[in-house]
Each structure stands twice: as structure tokens, then as C-alpha cells.
Amino acid sequence: AKLGAVYTEGGFVEGVNKKLGLLGDSVDIFKGIPFAAPTKALENPQPHPGWQGTLKAKNFKKRCLQATITQDSTYGDEDCLYLNIWVPQGRKQVSRDLPVMIWIYGGAFLMGSGHGANFLNNYLYDGEEIATRGNVIVVTFNYRVGPLGFLSTGDANLPGNYGLRDQHMAIAWVKRNIAAFGGDPNNITLFGESAGGASVSLQTLSPYNKGLIRRAISQSGVALSPWVIQKNPLFWAKKVAEKVGCPVGDAARMAQCLKVTDPRALTLAYKVPLAGLEYPMLHYVGFVPVIDGDFIPADPINLYANAADIDYIAGTNNMDGHIFASIDMPAINKGNKKVTEEDFYKLVSEFTITKGLRGAKTTFDVYTESWAQDPSQENKKKTVVDFETDVLFLVPTEIALAQHRANAKSAKTYAYLFSHPSRMPVYPKWVGADHADDIQYVFGKPFATPTGYRPQDRTVSKAMIAYWTNFAKTGDPNMGDSAVPTHWEPYTTENSGYLEITKKMGSSSMKRSLRTNFLRYWTLTYLALPTVTDQEATPVPPTGDSEATPVPPTGDSETAPVPPTGDSGAPPVPPTGDSGAPPVPPTGDSGAPPVPPTGDSGAPPVPPTGDSGAPPVPPTGDSGAPPVPPTGDSGAPPVPPTGDSGAPPVPPTGDAGPPPVPPTGDSGAPPVPPTGDSGAPPVTPTGDSETAPVPPTGDSGAPPVPPTGDSEAAPVPPTDDSKEAQMPAVIRF
């Protein structure tokens, strides 16, 4: 069966029907359907006016305008808001009421595209394998990134979050139109990785998406990750304004000037330094989402009630921090270079700057405890990776899972740890699953390009597609049309259970309490440390080119996690079980919840980089030479050669780009207040809203207030002798 021309709100569209095998199955593929009008710089997206005739939707459209990997030129286009759809078809009747999975790509909110990195015409985010193996509709789309997607003055002049609003427009378009493609508009699952995983999380929390999203999957990124929310957008807006010659004294004049500046100049005015960093990449974040008082009405920690009815999977890769650690400390990947205590202490102190000397020392002591028994370089390097994995990914993800669980009514919560090791041969053997290593398996690359992979990789891919698509169908990763290797139990605050995804999965893959002593440390001990306000605690921006200037964390405001407001439904921290490692006793009378103990976490794998972040797909054959990086719009990472290649594959370049950089410190600029009176829902903006906003929980524009004794969210009674406590909002470093 095949769809032929499909009528959408914009008009008729015609894709391509691709036959699969000899049994008559096929997949209808639509590429390049507009879901919004061509964008205007630094303006909200607007609906597409439509077209006459039948639109031929047969080729991917250009990505949104962004800097190339070398950051000296741009590629892509301002006219970029297009989506792509894969619809599986059986032999006889056209598909109906299929679950819908919408992918949101990562790339540090700075780069990426809906089709992903390309090698030999194989696009990373090609939805065919997921669609046909899982019998679901897959949708991918472009959204604006970098300054054009996220520049903000922190007020109504340039509220920001344009890229998030693009994402929302795509979701709302799918809701209105997917039935015509055979999809069930009442069963939409968002999934995404890194900045895409954080975007998924933010979309579930935004009042604009009420009623649009049924389920969500965040891979290596959640709204609470420290690199997701920019607390000082005005600082970065001024940096760009200075670069392009706009006045910075008056925000309104600056905004008007920026809107009429060449978008390419705006894009190139922000560069992420990738070498010789004076501070961790964390401090160089520029253009990411903001709390605008409208689309993101309050700190994400206070918005979890908005996601209470959405089934949720969240997880990380066991060495998600590897790529970042190797940028912050290049010795990590060099066998002949050593990591010293001084190096690590310096790194720790830069991450814990707002807690001053005590923060650095305590954190250093906790992480180096194993160094006395095992002073090997491998152990030290793993420690650095674990530290960045914890801070940037694991701890925020655990808090997000606990928040979701505590607010959820009938909705389910599931946690995972992806531990299938990286296939990048240039990495040391101890490296586990790096950032973005999971993507290739979710998108079925071991099946799409089988010569580049081993049977064990296909085992992992088959399992992930089965869990992900079952979840999209039923809300339970175990139930659906696809067999799974072992039962994945829901995450609860009692068990803190997570599934470890490896090549050999069985009943022992269900584990509990991941890295509890470290989770406990961050949410209890570290939080309770006093925040320092003296000048020494503030990093001095490096001199030289402004693009390398980190935002100094300011004062003590918001650096420590703030407990959620009264009825935010902030969950208590899951009680700990019998953790293998003794929890670090909290200092002081911390209001933060105890963290569950870790189980037997296993060594984490490391993911590849790339627009996708996904690991490169190896070329077929046993190439004797390293693959040449692809050219063109793809910017995709090359694929490592298979077989007994004489040379190691070239590490992926292209739109992999820098990993997402977490924002630091607190914003000097207040969030844009919601329109109307804060208890009421924000007034729906004209044009792009697409969904009536739900009133933000709590006092939207204002900083969260610590809950009072009779907070309506009753904490779950902790087990053992842990103190009853509220989960912290977000750990700010």
C-alpha cells in the first residue's frame, strides 16, 4: 500500500514510496514539508501560508543557518523550518492510527539538522529503520540554533527561545496533520538527544504544549542540566551586538539593530573556543534557552506538574562526559600524557566556583577517594570523565526522573544507562559510551549499514528500537509489537531502578541506585555549602577575542539549587537502599533530598561527536585508509572503516561540533515577566502560539521560594535513617 498525495493544512504533498524486500512492505517518505513560514531574524515563527498544486516532498531542505565546524563561515539557510516523515506501510491497506515519534536533534543549541550527519548518502537521523522495525511514524525537523535561535536580552525586547518555539510549531503541526499520513494525533512521543533531549524535556514542561504530547524520551539531556538554561542572556546579547556594531547601551535600540543585521554576521559573531580554554566549556555557553516568563514561564524545576500526564524515559550514557572532559583536559585521550591532582583540582574548582574553596576541596576529596588505592592514570582519567558525566548529565537526569515520578499521576517513569562502549578506535580502551554514542543504535545504523557494524551492535540496536517504539505505542517499553531482551521496570522513588543497556541483556540488567554516593554528594553535601560572594570566586574573562569570554558566575544568587516552590510537586529524593558505597554524610542541615545509592553501575561507554553527536558509521569494506570527511551541507562525521583497516578512522568532524556548554552563574537580566497577572496563564501570543498556554505553576516570573512546612507536595518518607528532604531544584555550579 502507499499513500500517494496527502492533503495537509498547507496543501497537497507527495513523497516517495520505497519498497522493502519481496513481501510487499514499503515506507512512504516525505522530505521537506514546511511547518512554518520562512523565518524573520529574532522573531517568533509564524504559520505557513500554504501553497497550490502538489508539493514534491522528496529532498531534505537545508539546515537552519549555523556556523561551520571551523566557525569561519556559515551554511544552511534562514528558510529552514521543514519537517520529514517516514510512514511504514504493509501490503494491503494504508496504515492508520500509528504511534508518532518526533525526533529533536542535539548539537549544543548551536548546530545540527533534522536529517543529521551524512556519510555516503546515509543520514544519521533517517527514520526508516525505526519506522519499519517498530511500525511507528517517525518525524524529524529543523529548528533555529545559535544566536538566531536563542539570542535574548532577557526582556521583552528580545525574549529568546525562538528555536524552542520552532520546535513547538513542528509538534503542533504534527498534531493537526499527522492523521492524514496515518498517524494517531493523540499518541505523539517526543525523543531527542543532548540539547535535543533537553528540548524534549523543556517542551513537556512548557504550557504551550498542553495536550499535544503523550510520551517523551530524553537521551543525555534534560531541562535541569546545567548547560540548558542561560541565566545571563544580556551578557551574551551584548557580546554579539558589539561584534556586529550594534549599540549596547539601550536594549530596545540594540534589539532593533540586531534584527536588521545580516543573519550570517550574527551567526559568526559567536564562536565557541575549542582549544586553549581558560575555563571548562561549561563557562562558555552562550545561546541556549532562557526563562522568558512565557514559553518557559519559570525555572524548569517548578514546572514538572505540566508533565504529570506524560510518560517519560530519561537516561544517560555511562561516559557522556568523556568528550567534554577531553576538551577540558586533553590528556584524557593521550596515553603518554598524565592527569595530575593539580589538573583535576583546577578543573573541579572551575566547576564549583560559586562554592569557593570549600566547594572545590570537598568535591575534589569525594572524587579522588579511590586514588589512594588505585593511583593509575586510567583510574584518574576515568575519574575526570565520571566527574563531568555526573555534573553535566547524570545528576540532573536523576533529579529530573525523581521530579517526574513525584508529580506523575498515572504516567510512568523509566530510567536507563547506555553502556555499549564507543567504537571510536582512537579512544583509549577504557572509554565507555561517549556522548551521542547511543544515537546510531536508536536509528538502526547497524541494520542500515551492516558492513560497518558487528552482530553485537545489531543486538543493541534491535533492543533499543524495540524498547523505544514499544514505549511510543503503549507507554510501557516492554509492551508492544516488539520482543525485548529483558523486562524494564519503572523508575520509582523507592527503587531508583534503571535498565543498563549493553550487548548482553538479561535479568541482571535491571539495576538500582546509580552512583548514589555521588548523587548524594551533589544534592546534599555540596548544596549545603555556603555560597561565596567574594571577588576571587569570579573568573576573570580571558582577554583577546570576545568570543572566548566566559560569563562569570555572579554572586550567590541561584548558584546553589533552590528548593522548588510550595506546590511545585517537587519530589523528595528517592530513599537509598543498601548502596555499595557509603553515602557521603551531608554537611549542615541540607534541605536537599537524599540520593539513592548506586548499584553496580558498570563502566560507561563513550559516544561519538557529530551533528548528531552520533558515532560515525564505518564505511563498508576493509578500507586501508581513513575515510575522508564528507563535504557539503552534511558536515557529518566520517564513518570509521571496518575490517582490518590499516589506519584509524578520522574522528568525526562536521557538525558534531562542540558539545553543549552549560551556562554558569546567575543572570543579571530578569526573566521576561509573563503577560497578565502571574497567577493566570500567559496571554497567548498572536501568530505562533498554536496552543493555549497552561498557567505556569508557582509564581512564574519570580525565583522559586523555598517551600514552607505545610507544602502541598508531601514528601515520600525516606527509608533508613536518611533525613526527610525536598529534592533540590537544580544544581548550579
Epitope: 493544512e9 498547507g10 496543501g11 497550490q52 498544486g53 492524514a180 495536550g211 502560539s689
Partner: antibody, heavy 119, light 105 residues
Framework: QVQLVQSGAEVKKPGASVKVSCKAS????????MHWVRQAPGQGLEWMGV????????SYAQKFKGRVTMTRDTSTSTVYMELSSLRSEDTAVYYC????????????WGQGTLVTVSS | DIQMTQSPSSLSASVGDRVTITCRAS?????LNWYQQKPGKAPKLLIY???RLPSGVPSRFSGSGSGTDFTLTISSLQPEDFATYYC????????FGQGTKLEIK
């Protein structure tokens, strides 16, 4: 100027079929989608489906799938709507309407064709 | 299908009055169109894309809204404005509101 002229009123028995025509003039026939909308006596408007006269692509409202067929004849700039298995509740005025621009604002309407289904 | 709910279903007003008709969509929509229909006649496009007026439509008609809530406003009623008004959403399966009959008081 744009004109849409529909065929005359019809009286049909239950179970029969009716075919209503809509002749377009004053514009390039193949450049704009044509929709069919009906209105039962004293009731509101109900969208039935759309045809692209350029390539003949059609889309029908779920309610009418299996009973309605829309076709076009580019040589005479005419679109047709055939509704089968008629029942008394199909008694209505049937309108053809052309897109105004872009998609779906129905900017130009035929005068309507009354179809009465009665035994 | 997307549901469109118009209110009021009927209203009485006098020449010169300012009149507002609302249309609520569930779930949210991108654009809304408004039509005017007089007895025995075909509907006429009044406003498209939420707020735009086709040529020939008097400027006393205006439209606004986004997401789920939309309004049609007639700033100063004229005798020829007494008619039935319909809203319509565009999606892959367009639907109309049930209509608002505007009568002379």
C-alpha cells in the same frame, strides 16, 4: 473574474448516486485546489473533501471516505463530485469552492446545488 | 478532528453597535478563516489567516487571536452585516464552527 458555475438541482432516491459538476472560469484551472462543502437545511457548513485539478490528487473527510469521489476534466475546466449510497440525511446544498490563495481560505464559491434525497 | 466551538450561537444587535464573535479550537490551530453567509446565498470569505481581509471586505471587520481562542469583531454594525458567520480551521481535515446568527435587535 473568477466564476464557479454548478449544475442544477437534483432529486434522488435513497441508495442512488448523484454527480454534481462545477465549471470554473476566469483563472488557470489547474493552479488552485477545489473543495466541496455541503450544508443541510438550517444547518452549518461541512467540508467533504478537496481535489487538486492539476494532478487529480484528492483528499476526503473521514465521514465520506468510500462514498465520495472527486474528479476533474481539465479540457473543460470542470470538477465533479459524486456521492453514492445516498440517504435522506444527504439532502443538502452542495457547494464547490476554490482556494483563495495558499491553502484553505475558500475565497470563491459556486452558487450551490440542492440535492434532495427522498423516496 | 479539530473541534470548533463558536459563541454565541445567536445574538441581537443594533446598527452602529460593536459586535464580537468568538471561536475556540480544540486542540490549537495555526490559522482561522471567517465567512459570512446570507439566507439563500453561498458563503463569502470575510477574513483569512486569522486577521487578513480579502479585497473588497470593509475595514470595520477585523479578526484576532491565536492558538485556541479567536475573535471576529465588527466595529460598527451596518444593515448589510446581519447574517450568519462561520469560523473555519485549516488542517488536513478542515472543519467549521456551528455558526453565529447575527440578528437585528
Amino acid at each position: 473574474q473568477v466564476q464557479l458555475v454548478q449544475s442544477g438541482a437534483e432529486v434522488k432516491k435513497p441508495g442512488a448516486s448523484v454527480k454534481v459538476s462545477c465549471k470554473a472560469s476566469g483563472y488557470t484551472f489547474t493552479s488552485y485546489n477545489m473543495h466541496w462543502v455541503r450544508q443541510a437545511p438550517g444547518q452549518g457548513l461541512e467540508w467533504m473533501g478537496v481535489i487538486n485539478p492539476g494532478d487529480g490528487a484528492t483528499s476526503y473527510a473521514q465521514k465520506f471516505k468510500g462514498r465520495v469521489t472527486m474528479t476533474r476534466d481539465t479540457s473543460t475546466s470542470t470538477v465533479y463530485m459524486e456521492l453514492s449510497s445516498l440517504r435522506s440525511e444527504d439532502t443538502a446544498v452542495y457547494y464547490c469552492a476554490r482556494d483563495y490563495y495558499g491553502s484553505s481560505p475558500l475565497g470563491y464559491w459556486g452558487q450551490g446545488t440542492l440535492v434532495t434525497v427522498s423516496s | 478532528d479539530i473541534q470548533m466551538t463558536q459563541s454565541p450561537s445567536s445574538l441581537s444587535a443594533s446598527v452602529g453597535d460593536r459586535v464580537t464573535i468568538t471561536c475556540r479550537a480544540s486542540p490549537s490551530i495555526s490559522y482561522l478563516n471567517w465567512y459570512q453567509q446570507k439566507p439563500g446565498k453561498a458563503p463569502k470569505l470575510l477574513i483569512y489567516a486569522t486577521s487578513r481581509l480579502p479585497s473588497g471586505v470593509p475595514s470595520r471587520f477585523s479578526g484576532s487571536g491565536s492558538g485556541t481562542d479567536f475573535t471576529l469583531t465588527i466595529s460598527s454594525l451596518q444593515p448589510e452585516d446581519f447574517a450568519t458567520y462561520y469560523c473555519q480551521q485549516r488542517s488536513s481535515s478542515p472543519t467549521f464552527g456551528q455558526g453565529t446568527k447575527l440578528e437585528i435587535k
